[in-house]
C-alpha cells in the first residue's frame, strides 16, 4: 500500500497556504481526488508530488494515491480542509441526478472541520426541507438525501453556521428520476385496416411511461406525420394520444403506420399496415388439397380460410351427395377469427362413415357477393376379395373378385395342401395379374376389379388363393377343391371356403 | 497494463437509440473517474461528462447535459454511454477516457457513431 | 468554437524546433494546469504533457509544456516524421467545471 505524507488522515491548512502532498509506493504511483483539480502533479522519481503555492477552498477535498502496479489494488488517501472564513463550502458539482430510491450526495464539502456541529440542509431561499426527508452529512464528502424520491427534485443549499450567522453554499440542483423499467408502453390500434376508397378511417397511436419525459409519433411510410398530441396523467403513467382522422380515403393514405415512442432507455415502435381497396372483396382459400382422400373410419378436418372487407354477412357448410341427403352437423362446424379481416373455418368430420363420401361445400356472403369452396371427399377402403370356380368357353377358371379404393393389385398363388392362408414354405407358384379387369369405378365409390385364372386340372390336395392389396390394407380368399376330378364338374359341385 | 476497449462502430437512423460501452481493465475501476469525449468530423474535441463508476456520481458538460446518459456497471467494469433518439448531428467519434485531476490519461480507441436516414 | 484558441496548422522540417500555442482566461489556464494531447491519425489520443510540463513515461524528452498567465506552450525539438499528427491543449475550466479543449493544431513535417 502506498504511503502519504504527511501521515495524517486529514490535513487543516489556511488560504494561501503552501500545500506538498507527497505519495511514495514500491513502484510508480498516481494521485487522483475530485474532478476539478487546482494543483500542480509532479513526479520525483518512485514518489509522485500533488502541490499548490496558493492553495483555496476549491482544494478542500479527499485525495488518494494508489500503487496500479499492486494486483491488490491497495491506495492510501488524505482529506485536506483549506478553513476560508468566507467559504466554508467547496461544491463539487451545481447539479446532481439519480434516480428514485437511490441516494443522493449533494457533493457541498465543508472546508472547516470545526463547523460540522453546525451544518444543515435547507431548500434554496430558505425554505425547510419537505417532510420525510431523511439525510446525512458528512463533512469529507457533503449531504446525503437517502433514498430521494421524485418530488425531492429541489434546489438546495448547504448551510453552517459561522460566528452565529448562518452561510450558505452555491445552489445544488437535484433531479429525481422515476426509475424507467423501459421504453414507454405503446398501442396502436387497429393492427390493420382495410377500407374501400371514401370510406372514413381512424388510427390512434398511444403511448404511456411512468415519467413525461418522451416523445412519440406517427409515421406513413417513413413520413412523420404532423398530427396534434394529447396528453393525460392517470393510474400514476402520463400518456400521450396521436389520432389520425381520415375522412375520405384513398390510395395514397395506404402503407404501413408505425407508432414510435423513445425515452432515455431507448425506443420502442410498432407498426400496422392499411390496405385501401376499390370495392369489397371476399376470397376464399385452403391450405388442404382440395381432393382429399381418407381412410374410411377416420376423422378429418376441412379448413377454409376467409379473407373479406365488409364483414361476412353469412356462411354455412353444405353437403352435395352423392349418397344421401344429410347435412352436415351444425355442432361440427367451428369458426375461428385470426383477426379483423381473416377468419377460418373448420367442418370436423369424426369416424368417417362410407355414406359421408362425395362433396363439401363452404359458402360465404358478403357485400362483395356469395363464393364457394367446395372440397372432393373420397374414402379410402381395404380390398375385400371373394372367388367362384366357373367354365368360361369351356376351360376351366377362377374367378376373383376385388372390391376397395385405391384400385387393388391381384396375386394369385397356388401352394400345396388344405390352407386359409398360403404361406411362403407351400407355396408352388405365384401369378401377378398386372392388368385384372375393372369391372365398376364411380366416383367416391369403391373401384371393383376381377381377376381370372384358368386351371386344366384342380388338384385337390393344393389351395388356390387371391390375394388383393392397396395402400389400405390387403384381402384374400383360399379357394380348397374337395373331390377329386374336379375339372370336369360344373363349380356348384365344389365346396370352398372364404 | 491500463486499457479502455470500446464497442465498435454504429449505423443507425434518426430516431433510433443506441447504448456504446467502453471497458477498462488493468486499473482499480471503481477509484478513477471515466469521461467521454465527442470529435465531430473535421472538428476539435468536446468533453461531454464523466462519471465516478464506484458510486456512480455523475457530471455532464451543460452542453450535453439532458442529450446523453453516461453509465456504468462495475461488475464488468464497463462504462457507457447512451441515446434514446439520435440525430444526423451526432455522427461522431465519440471517445472513453481515463480522467485523473483534471486530465485524461489513458483514451480508449474511438466508437464511430453514423446517423443517416 | 472552442474555448481555448490554437492555430489551426504549424509546420516544420525534420530536426527544426517548433512551438504550438494555446490561450485561455482566467476561469481556465489562469487557474488550472494545462495538458496537451496528440492524435496521430487512425490512432487513440495519447496525453502527451499534463500539470503544464510533466511528461507521462514513454513520451520523449522532445516534447516539453510551459504555461505563463493565461497562456501556454508545447515545444516540439528535433522534429521527427513521426510527429506529424494533430495537438490539442486542455485544461479545467471552473466555470464549466469541466475540461475544455482547444480547437487542435495540426502539425505537418514537411
Known amino acids: 500500500i502506498p504511503v502519504i505524507e504527511p501521515s495524517v488522515p486529514e490535513l487543516v491548512v489556511k488560504p494561501g497556504a503552501t500545500v506538498t502532498l507527497r505519495c511514495v509506493g514500491n513502484g510508480s504511483v498516481e494521485w487522483d481526488g475530485p474532478p476539478s483539480p487546482h494543483w500542480t502533479l509532479y513526479s520525483d522519481g518512485s514518489s509522485s508530488i500533488l502541490s499548490t503555492n496558493n492553495a483555496t477552498f476549491q482544494n478542500t477535498g479527499t485525495y488518494r494515491c494508489t500503487e496500479p502496479g499492486d494486483p491488490l489494488g491497495g491506495s492510501a488517501a488524505i482529506h485536506l480542509y483549506v478553513k476560508d472564513p468566507a467559504r466554508p463550502w467547496n461544491v463539487l458539482a451545481q447539479e446532481v441526478v439519480v434516480f428514485e430510491d437511490q441516494d443522493a450526495l449533494l457533493p457541498c464539502l465543508l472546508t472547516d472541520p470545526v463547523l460540522e456541529a453546525g451544518v444543515s440542509l435547507v431548500r434554496v431561499r430558505g425554505r425547510p426541507l419537505m417532510r420525510h426527508t431523511n439525510y446525512s452529512f458528512s463533512p469529507w464528502h457533503g449531504f446525503t438525501i437517502h433514498r430521494a424520491k421524485f418530488i425531492q427534485s429541489q434546489d438546495y443549499q448547504c448551510s453552517a453556521l459561522m460566528g452565529g450567522r448562518k452561510v450558505m453554499s452555491i445552489s445544488i440542483r437535484l433531479k429525481v428520476q422515476k426509475v424507467i423499467p423501459g421504453p414507454p408502453a405503446l398501442t396502436l390500434v387497429p393492427a390493420e385496416l382495410v377500407r374501400i376508397r371514401g370510406e372514413a378511417a381512424q388510427i390512434v397511436c398511444s403511448a404511456s411511461s411512468v415519467d413525461v419525459n418522451f416523445d412519440v409519433f406517427l409515421q406513413h411510410n417513413n413520413t412523420k406525420l404532423a398530427i396534434p398530441q394529447q396528453s393525460d396523467f392517470h393510474n400514476n403513467r402520463y400518456q400521450k394520444v396521436l389520432t389520425l382522422n381520415l375522412d375520405q380515403v384513398d390510395f395514397q393514405h395506404a402503407g404501413n403506420y408505425s407508432c414510435v415512442a423513445s425515452n432515455v432507455q431507448g425506443k420502442h415502435s410498432t407498426s400496422m399496415f392499411f390496405r385501401v381497396v376499390e370495392s369489397a372483396y371476399l376470397n376464399l382459400s385452403s391450405e388442404q388439397n382440395l381432393i382429399q382422400e381418407v381412410t374410411v373410419g377416420e376423422g378429418l378436418n376441412l379448413k377454409v380460410m376467409v379473407e373479406a372487407y365488409p364483414g361476412l354477412q353469412g356462411f354455412n357448410w353444405t353437403y352435395l351427395g352423392p349418397f344421401s341427403d344429410h347435412q352436415p352437423e351444425p355442432k361440427l362446424a367451428n369458426a375461428t377469427t385470426k383477426d379483423t379481416y381473416r377468419h377460418t373455418f373448420t367442418l370436423s368430420l369424426p369416424r368417417l362413415k362410407p355414406s359421408e363420401a362425395g362433396r363439401y361445400s363452404f359458402l360465404a356472403r358478403n357485400p362483395g357477393g356469395w363464393r364457394a369452396l367446395t372440397f372432393e371427399l373420397t374414402l379410402r377402403y381395404p380390398p375385400e376379395v371373394s372367388v367362384i370356380w366357373t367354365f368360361i368357353n369351356g376351360s376351366g377358371t377362377l374367378l376373383c373378385a376385388a372390391s376397395g379404393y385405391p384400385q387393388p393389385n391381384v396375386t394369385w398363388l397356388q401352394c400345396s395342401g388344405h390352407t386359409d392362408r398360403c404361406d411362403e414354405a407351400q407355396v408352388l407358384q405365384v401369378w401377378d395379374d398386372p392388368y385384372p379387369e375393372v369391372l365398376s369405378q364411380e366416383p367416391f365409390h369403391k373401384v371393383t376389379v376381377q381377376s381370372l385364372l384358368t386351371v386344366e386340372t384342380l388338384e385337390h390336395n393344393q389351395t388356390y388363393e387371391c390375394r388383393a392389396h392397396n395402400s389400405v390394407g390387403s384381402g384374400s380368399w383360399a379357394f380348397i377343391p374337395i373331390s377329386a376330378g374336379a375339372h370336369t364338374h360344373p363349380p356348384d359341385e365344389f365346396l370352398f371356403t372364404p | 497494463e491500463v486499457q479502455l476497449v470500446q464497442s465498435g462502430a454504429e449505423v443507425k437512423k434518426p430516431g433510433e437509440s443506441l447504448k456504446i460501452s467502453c471497458k477498462g481493465s488493468?486499473?482499480?475501476?471503481?477509484?478513477?473517474?471515466i469521461g467521454w469525449v465527442r470529435q465531430m468530423p473535421g472538428k476539435g474535441l468536446e468533453w461531454m461528462g464523466i462519471?465516478?463508476?464506484?458510486?456512480?456520481?455523475?457530471r455532464y458538460s451543460p452542453s450535453f447535459q439532458g442529450q446523453v446518459t453516461i453509465s456504468a456497471d462495475i461488475s464488468i467494469t464497463t462504462a457507457y454511454l447512451q441515446w434514446s433518439s439520435l440525430k444526423a448531428s451526432d455522427t461522431a467519434m465519440y471517445y472513453c477516457?481515463?480522467?485523473?485531476?483534471?486530465?485524461?490519461?489513458?483514451w480508449g480507441q474511438g466508437t464511430l457513431v453514423t446517423v443517416s436516414s | 468554437q472552442s474555448v481555448l484558441t490554437q492555430p489551426p496548422s504549424a509546420s516544420g522540417t525534420p530536426g527544426q524546433r517548433v512551438t504550438i500555442s494555446c490561450s485561455g482566461s482566467?476561469?481556465?489556464?489562469?487557474?488550472?494546469?494545462v495538458n496537451w494531447y496528440q492524435l496521430l491519425p487512425g490512432t487513440a489520443p495519447k496525453l502527451l504533457i499534463y500539470?503544464?510540463?510533466q511528461r507521462p513515461s514513454g513520451v520523449p524528452d522532445r516534447f516539453s509544456g510551459s504555461q505563463s498567465g493565461t497562456s501556454a506552450s508545447l515545444a516540439i525539438s528535433g522534429l521527427q516524421s513521426e510527429d506529424e499528427a494533430d495537438y490539442y491543449c486542455?485544461?479545467?475550466?471552473?466555470?464549466?467545471?469541466?475540461?475544455?479543449f482547444g480547437g487542435g493544431t495540426k502539425l505537418t513535417v514537411l
Open positions: 482566467s476561469s481556465n489556464i489562469g487557474s488550472n494546469t
Open positions: 488493468g486499473y482499480s475501476f471503481t477509484n478513477y473517474w
Open positions: 486542455a485544461a479545467w475550466d471552473d466555470s464549466l467545471n469541466g475540461p475544455v
Open positions: 500539470s503544464n510540463n
Open positions: 462519471i465516478y463508476p464506484g458510486d456512480s456520481d455523475t
Open positions: 477516457a481515463r480522467h485523473r485531476l483534471g486530465f485524461f490519461d489513458y
